[in-house]
């Protein structure tokens, strides 16, 4: 029995769902009563999920796995793994036994994008040319370990006097802290780039240091210029910082987070106390960091509806506010391809190829091309429907007249994550059926 899995690792983002594809070619007259299917961890042989005696035996893996019962009879033994964690990374074996049997292993590569780095200076006041300053670049909750690069305003790499540490939290996600020690010139820009090697995602920040600083005591509220990109289901940190005056105490602090447009209260700190979340109990401050001027807000289990602008308002003796944008995103699933008609295809036949990709956000861009990479733009109809959570299912239909043979590829791009998901189908000249039989 030929059991087929993807050669390349399946890359899944922490907190999202992943599909571990596995297919077999059912013999004529096959019924599910004959199927025995086992998913297990390749190394430890720990049972993950099974199907036997005509029944789904359920998940043996923290109740986070599911088969596709409607597709099993067609030979689709794929496994859905929900709310992916770092600990899930590794090899999964799909074992199929009917009369014949076979197995194949698929690798799951887990990834999490790093947050936009925050930059801090020490010392951060009364800086003059010639002073030695320590610049710390911190980026959070990424996986796997990052590559960190520093450069100056002219793009010249800075490699000396750099110390980078990466610490994994309980979930296995890494917080990266990279420290650069420099002697200040008249002024200068220092950039830090944190790269996720799996996602090929770069997160950067820079700090420009000029000798004069704002006068002691003034409140400068600072938020990232770029939108914070957060994946649906994960946690996001809306960064906000202020410069506490000397002798500042939390009893003097009044902090309000609210939705910029509607002014709806999200979270507040006043009268020396965290007043708690006014936003579906999904927000939290960083109480241990407030006294240092860190007024950042943690938003848990991000939803599509959270997208928008949040204002951080700080009032001590002086006051100030700034707005930070939250851009929500969800990766699109690997497209599934279907043909209509899908039997006895011959050159000259008109065939409808449907490319479907699921549960992404925001709306996708869809591109078709032939085997030579030439774009196919005519006779394409694409529809995108949002579900209750606001996530989009994309269905793109291409109508083509078959040549002697041909490959048709569909690419579904998430414009925010710059994530491409592709599917392709190859149709050969001789009469054929799709999917191919054994």
């Amino acid at each position: 029995l030929e059991v087929q899995v993807p050669e390349d690792p399946v890359v899944a983002l922490v907190g999202t769902d992943a599909t571990l594809c596995c297919s077999f070619s059912p013999e004529p007259g096959f019924s599910l009563a004959q199927l025995n299917l086992i998913w297990q961890l390749t190394d430890t042989k720990q049972l993950v999920h099974s199907f036997a005696e005509g029944q789904d035996q359920g998940s043996a893996y923290a109740n986070r796995t599911a088969l596709f019962p409607d597709l099993l009879a067609q030979g689709n033994a794929s496994l859905r793994l929900q709310r992916v964690r770092v600990a899930d990374e590794g090899s999964f074996t799909c074992f199929v036994s009917i009369r014949d049997f076979g197995s194949a292993a698929v690798s799951l590569q887990v990834a999490a994008p790093y947050s936009k780095p925050s930059m801090t200076l020490e010392p951060n006041k009364d800086l003059r040319p010639g002073d030695t300053v320590t610049i710390t670049c911190s980026s959070y909750q990424g996986y796997p370990e990052a590559e960190v690069f520093w450069q100056d305003g002219q793009g010249v790499p800075l490699t000396g006097n750099v110390t980078t540490s990466q610490m994994a939290n309980e979930q296995g996600l890494f917080d990266v802290h990279s420290i650069l020690r420099v002697v200040l010139g008249a002024n200068g820009t220092y950039s830090c780039l944190v790269r996720n090697p799996v996602l090929q995602q770069d997160a950067h920040s820079s700090v420009t240091i000029t000798p004069q600083r704002s006068p002691t005591g003034a409140v400068e509220v600072q938020v990232p210029e770029d939108p914070v990109v957060a994946l649906v289901g994960t946690d996001a940190t809306l960064r906000c910082s202020f410069s506490p005056e000397p002798g500042f105490s939390l009893a003097q602090l009044n902090l309000i987070w609210q939705l910029t447009d509607t002014k709806q209260l999200v979270h507040s700190f006043t009268e020396g106390r965290d007043q708690g979340s006014a936003y579906a109990n999904r927000t939290a401050l960083f109480p241990d960091l407030l006294a240092q001027g860190n007024a950042s807000l943690r938003l848990q289990r991000v939803r599509v509806a959270d997208e928008g602008s949040f204002t951080c308002f700080v009032s001590i003796r002086d006051f100030g506010s700034a707005a930070v944008s939250l851009q929500v995103a969800a990766p699109y699933s690997k497209p599934s391809m279907t043909l209509e008609p899908n039997k006895d295809l011959r050159p000259g036949d008109t065939v409808t190829i449907t490319c479907s990709s699921y549960r992404g956000y925001p709306e996708a861009e869809v591109f078709w091309q032939d085997g030579q990479g030439v774009p196919l733009t005519g006779n394409v109809t694409t529809s995108q429907m949002a579900n209750e959570q606001g996530l989009f299912d994309v269905h793109s239909v291409l109508r083509v007249v078959l040549g002697a043979n041909g490959t048709y590829s569909c690419l579904v791009r998430n414009p925010v994550l710059q994530q491409d998901a592709h599917g392709s189908v190859t149709i050969t000249g001789q009469p054929m059926t799709f999917p191919p039989e054994a």
């Epitope: 006068p215 409140v219 100030g320």
Partner: antibody, heavy 118, light 110 residues
Framework: EVQLLESGGGLVQPGGSLRLSCAAS????????MHWVRQAPGKGLEWVSA????????YYADSVKGRFTISRDNSKNTLYLQMNSLRAEDTAVYYC???????????WGQGTLVTVSS | QSVLTQPPSASGTPGQRVTISCSGG????????VNWYQQLPGTAPKLLIY???KRPSGVPDRFSGSKSGTSASLAISGLRSEDEADYYC???????????FGGGTKLTVL
């Protein structure tokens, strides 16, 4: 001694403009948020506008939004309120105040009278 | 119409204790501190109580403030004739992104 001294008030016709100034002394001006508060004759206090110590953040009451502009010159220790498209209901004594902890206002000027009338 | 509601007037005799109330909502008093001001006739207002109950230096301890839920109150004990003035409560309103005052209470010492 900490002092705030308003100037620039006077009589102006409806639709006209006026610029109020507030000279601050006795404290580090750039480290305090500043406000304008007004009081119509025989009425209560009404907050008008506020500006942060650096001048980077500004706030306005709905009643003046789009017509009034608050600004400051930290090198001159001076707060300003540019009032355009003035209406009769803008007639009031305008106070310049210094921001304080807990959203308070701990120092007030003596006020300057703005009369909008034809 | 003020965002914060105060009684227009209050009165008391010398030596008595009087209380002035200030009522608001969840976006102002309910989630932010309250300040109180005294305005003597013909003068600029003066900060009397800040942060619900704190007194600036120079303010006698006869003046006290408190807050509960979406309401606040100012208490003046041992009333004196020089306490005759207008009293205003004030807070920050997060839904308006602005500072707000009560309509003021005129206190008469009989």
């Amino acid at each position: 001694e900490v002092q705030l001294l308003e100037s620039g008030g006077g009589l102006v016709q409806p639709g006209g403009s006026l610029r109020l100034s507030c000279a601050a002394s006795g404290f580090t001006f750039s480290t305090y948020g500043m406000h304008w508060v007004r009081q119509a004759p025989g009425k209560g206090l009404e907050w008008v506008s506020a500006i942060s110590g650096s001048g980077g953040s500004t706030y306005y009451a709905d009643s003046v939004k789009g017509r009034f502009t608050i600004s400051r010159d930290n090198s001159k220790n001076t707060l300003y309120l540019q009032m355009n498209s003035l209406r009769a209901e803008d007639t009031a004594v305008y106070y310049c105040t210094r921001g304080y902890y807990y959203y308070g206002m701990d120092v007030w000027g003596q006020g300057t009278l703005v009369t909008v009338s034809s | 119409q003020s965002v914060l509601t105060q009684p227009p007037s209050a009165s008391g005799t010398p030596g008595q204790r009087v209380t002035i109330s200030c009522s608001g909502g969840s976006s102002n008093i309910g989630s932010n501190p309250v300040n109180w001001y005294q305005q003597l006739p013909g003068t600029a207002p003066k900060l009397l109580i800040y942060g619900n109950s704190k007194r600036p230096s120079g303010v006698p301890d006869r003046f006290s403030g408190s807050k509960s839920g979406t309401s606040a109150s100012l208490a003046i004990s041992g009333l004196r004739s020089e306490d005759e003035a207008d009293y205003y409560c004030q807070s920050y309103d997060s839904s308006l992104s602005g500072w707000v005052f009560g309509g003021g209470t005129k206190l008469t010492v009989l």
